[in-house]
């Protein structure tokens, strides 16, 4: 019996009946055995076929076998109802070997030419399976020359049998208070040869409840308890199961915070599995009763471990734990069924006693001493000498606990001193130096510190003066002895003030003329305003209209009098403003250097002399009455003049204050 080629030789070739293409002889028997490599099969087809036809091919035939199975018995030229000729059919071995047998009997009625066939080895596609046959692989089948291999979807691993996909279904831990878990692929059939472990692990104090839902279908056996596939539930207290079959197991109240669910499957079966919905419970905490004027959120039927609530107070009420304020309050239910903190109170907001208003007073409007939410108070300033700045003084206790003005300000109103008040009434005429009376010049300040000088009170904590008067003390402000509220220079009865800082105009050069002869002294404390101590006003923009040539200004001070001594009593003189050109010309001739009188100066006095300020008056104010506001304002600061005070043809020279308003305002606002 001829053998066909065997692997690893190339497996292909030709087979033919003896004597082909001539007729074959009687009583012939020829057998070929073809062998292909593992994972390959043999393909065979006929290019010529002419054998004697007989019933069931009993006489002459070609038989194709693969292992124990006969693939075909062939005879004739064309197929009939009971006999088969190959025609254009192709034949395939079942494995890697194919046996071909040719036989002729003792006679032929006529000559037959036999057969010619060709064969070749080809790869078996193990992944192709006939309908109704089990698939080669559980999930994915991959064919290759000479073989195949299986692989699995994500979440599965190939079993050691190399075909089955076992689920990777262990190690899942559920920590939420409720959830769902199910067999892999549920509700589709669960995988074979799998061992799944699920854990529910909640915080101590919780108890897990298991409910089987929808459907339950786990392979079972009529006599033996769950021998194939099974579900088991284990807690630290007890084990439940095994479960299998088609009946939903009852609810399981585990009374445990940890549960392990085990699901094991074998290699056979087609079942949909199971689904569990789990919840948890715990010892409830006492129902929270909201404090008066507060509410609980969220509102729940019950509160168990880890549940929380917050307290929110009505507008105008605040959270307090005793005396301690809280912005927010949240309590959490603990495992022993108690809240982690006590309930706070929602207390009405109390703004507390309002702050005292310097130079003012406060009045309770809602009721005596009422300082709670929506209470109203009214601030007012001491009449005559103070006026309220910016707001109307009405404040309400708001929900944030602060007294708040109608403009939304939480700061106190400011009682600003009224400026420019004087007891003096002026006539239009000029007369000689006179003694001042109480209240005539309440802005007058006496400055002692090396020499005697003067100044004028601005607001309640600034003094306006001449730069030359305080130049020596600019670095030692505390050396200045500042007195006010007195007429007599040497009187022990005065209001004492001390300097915190001296600000000399940066354009002033000492001993080089008197341009920019202006300075400000900041007092270290505010002074109390009264009829004898009142600030002078600064000039308004429109003030120039009251300071034209021949308009009357008043200078006051304790400077030298005609007798050559410092005045004991405060003196004043009414003097007219002098034309600027006239004044400039008066000081052009020697001994005065050219340009002595600048645009930053104004002059006042009589051409005939006799009325003037003098040494000791330096820094004092030359004041004018604003007839529209009926307030006095400072137009000039006593600066310089002729060597002989009150000399005819010479005038007192004053720093022109209106030129320095921005400078004054900047310093006061900055410091």
């Amino acid at each position: 019996t001829p053998l066909g080629p065997k692997w690893p030789e190339p497996v292909f070739g030709r087979l033919a009946s003896p004597g082909f293409p001539g007729e074959y002889a009687n009583d012939q028997e020829r057998r070929w055995t073809l062998t292909a490599p593992p994972g390959y099969r043999l393909r065979l087809y006929f290019t010529h076929f002419d054998l004697e036809l007989s019933h069931l091919c009993e006489y002459d035939f070609v038989k194709l076998s693969s292992g124990a199975k006969v693939l075909a018995t062939l005879c004739g030229q064309e197929s009939t109802d009971t006999e088969r000729a190959p025609g254009k059919d192709t034949f395939y071995s079942l494995g890697s070997s194919l046996d071909i047998t040719f036989r002729s009997d003792y006679s032929n009625e006529k000559p037959f030419t036999g057969f010619e066939a060709f064969y070749a080895a080809e790869d078996i596609d193990e992944c192709q399976v006939a309908p109704g046959e089990a698939p080669t692989c559980d999930h994915h089948c991959h064919n290759h020359l000479g073989g195949f291999y299986c692989s699995c979807r994500a979440g599965y691993v190939l079993h050691r049998n190399k075909r089955t996909c076992s689920a990777l279904c262990s190690g899942q831990v559920f920590t939420q208070r409720s959830g769902e878990l199910s067999s892999p692929e549920y509700p589709r059939p669960y995988p074979k040869l799998s061992s799944c472990t699920y854990s529910i692990s909640l915080e101590e104090g919780f108890s897990v409840i298991l409910d089987f839902v929808e459907s339950f279908d786990v392979e079972t056996h009529p006599e033996t308890l769950c021998p194939y596939d099974f579900l088991k539930i284990q807690t630290d207290r007890e084990e439940h199961g095994p479960f299998c079959g088609k009946t939903l197991p009852h609810r399981i109240e585990t009374k445990s915070n940890t549960v392990t669910i085990t699901f094991v499957t074998d290699e056979s079966g087609d079942h949909t599995g199971w689904k569990i919905h789990y919840t948890s419970t715990a010892q409830p905490c006492p129902y929270p009763m909201a404090p008066p004027n507060g509410h609980v959120s969220p509102v729940q039927a019950k509160y168990i471990l880890k549940d929380s609530f917050s307290i929110f107070c009505e507008t105008g009420y605040e959270l307090l734990q005793g005396h301690l304020p809280l912005k927010s309050f949240t309590a959490v239910c603990q495992k022993d069924g108690s809240w982690d903190r006590p309930m706070p109170a929602c207390s009405i907001v109390d703004c507390g006693p309002p702050d005292d208003l310097p130079s003012g007073r406060v009045e309770y409007i809602t009721g005596p001493g009422v300082t709670t939410y929506k209470a109203v108070i009214q601030y007012s300033c001491e009449e005559t000498f103070y006026t309220m700045k910016v707001n109307d003084g009405k404040y309400v206790c708001e929900a944030d606990g602060f007294w708040t003005s109608s403009k939304g300000e939480k700061s106190l109103p400011v009682c600003e001193p009224v400026c420019g008040l004087s007891a003096r009434t002026t006539g239009g005429r000029i007369y000689g130096g006179q003694k001042a009376k109480p209240g005539d010049f309440p802005w007058q300040v006496l400055i002692l510190g090396g020499t005697t000088a003067a100044g004028a009170l601005l607001y309640d904590n600034w003094v306006l003066t001449a730069a030359h008067a305080v130049y020596e003390q600019k670095h030692d402000a505390s050396a200045l002895d500042i007195r006010m509220g007195t007429l007599k220079r040497l009187s022990p009865h005065y209001t004492q003030a001390w300097s915190e800082a001296v600000f000399i105009h940066e354009g002033y050069t000492h001993d080089a003329g008197f341009d920019n002869d202006i300075a400000l002294i900041k007092l270290n404390n505010k002074v109390v305003i009264n009829s004898n101590i009142t600030p002078i006003c600064l000039p308004r923009k429109e003030a120039e209209s009251f300071m034209r040539t021949d308009d009357i200004g008043t200078a006051s001070g304790w400077g030298l009098t005609q007798r050559g001594f410092l005045a004991r009593n405060l003196m004043y003189v009414d003097i007219p403003i002098v034309d600027h050109q006239k004044c400039t010309a008066a000081y052009e001739k020697p001994p005065y250097p050219r340009g002595s009188v600048t645009a930053n100066m104004l002059c006042a006095g009589l051409e005939s002399g006799g009325k003037d300020s003098c040494r000791g008056d330096s820094g004092g104010a030359l004041v004018f009455l604003d007839s529209e506001t009926e307030r006095w304002f400072v137009g000039g600061i006593v600066s310089w003049g002729s060597m002989n005070c009150g000399e005819a043809g010479q005038y007192g020279v004053y720093t022109k204050v209106i030129n320095y308003i921005p400078w004054i305002e900047n310093i006061i606002s900055d410091f």
Epitope: Q321, H323, L324, P325, R341, G401
Partner: antibody, heavy 118, light 105 residues
């Protein structure tokens, strides 16, 4: 973690003002709670001086009300103590502390010793 | 409100149970805290709202009381518990007790 740190002069002259700063890290003083000043006298007696709340409102020990002021600088997360007209009786260790009556932990600074002496 | 800790010193032994008391001059509800202070250290909060233990505080420390009478109990005293204990009321303003020093017999 919340931390409080007191700072200020260790020596103050009688009749002057005592000024201390408490710097808070790890929590904003405007978020919640009362931010307190507490002092401990030699002999260990503790005295609450006052607080400034998360909203900026203050509460003072009535015995100190006329001379105490507690303020804050929210941009620096600091609050301050000013005690005026001090005497030798004000010699103590001064603590700043976050107190919440159980709402959140209580946190104290490590304390700063202040001596009032001429 | 005055908080009175009548015992300035208390002697105890390791393993003992000891109770520190505090009396308020008027009703303070449960707005009382307890503090432990060791030499050279700041006070450390133990108990709030009379009976609630701060997290991290050993459960051998227990607070009780309401109204005017309050107690801090230490069961199974440990050597590290030897310190001074202060009560604080925060019902109306804040007032501390004068302190009770726990020492070894």
């Amino acid at each position: 973690d919340v931390q409080l740190q007191e700072s200020g002069p260790g020596l103050v002259k009688p009749s002057q003002s005592l000024s201390l700063t408490c710097t808070v890290t790890g929590y904003s003083i405007t978020s919640d709670y009362a931010w307190n000043w507490i002092r401990q006298f030699p002999g260990n007696k503790l005295e609450w001086m006052g607080y400034i709340s998360y909203s900026g409102r203050t509460s003072y020990n009535p015995s100190l009300k006329s001379r105490i002021s507690i303020t804050r600088d929210t941009s620096k997360n600091q609050f301050f103590l000013q005690l005026n007209s001090v005497t030798t009786e004000d010699t103590a260790t001064y603590y700043c502390a976050k107190l919440g009556g159980g709402h959140g932990m209580d946190y104290w600074g490590q304390g700063t010793s202040v001596t009032v002496s001429s | 409100i005055v908080m009175t800790q009548s015992q300035k010193f208390m002697s105890t032994s390791v393993g003992d149970r000891v109770s520190v008391t505090c009396k308020a001059s008027q009703n303070v509800d449960t707005n009382v805290a307890w503090y432990q202070q060791k030499p050279g250290q700041s006070p450390k909060a133990l108990i709030y709202s009379a009976s609630y233990r701060y997290s991290g505080v050993p459960d051998r420390f227990t607070g009780s009381g309401s109204g005017t009478d309050f107690t801090l109990t230490i069961s199974n005293v440990q050597s590290e518990d030897l310190a001074e204990y202060f009560c604080l009321q925060y019902n109306s303003y804040l007032t501390f007790g004068s302190g009770t020093k726990l020492e070894l017999k």
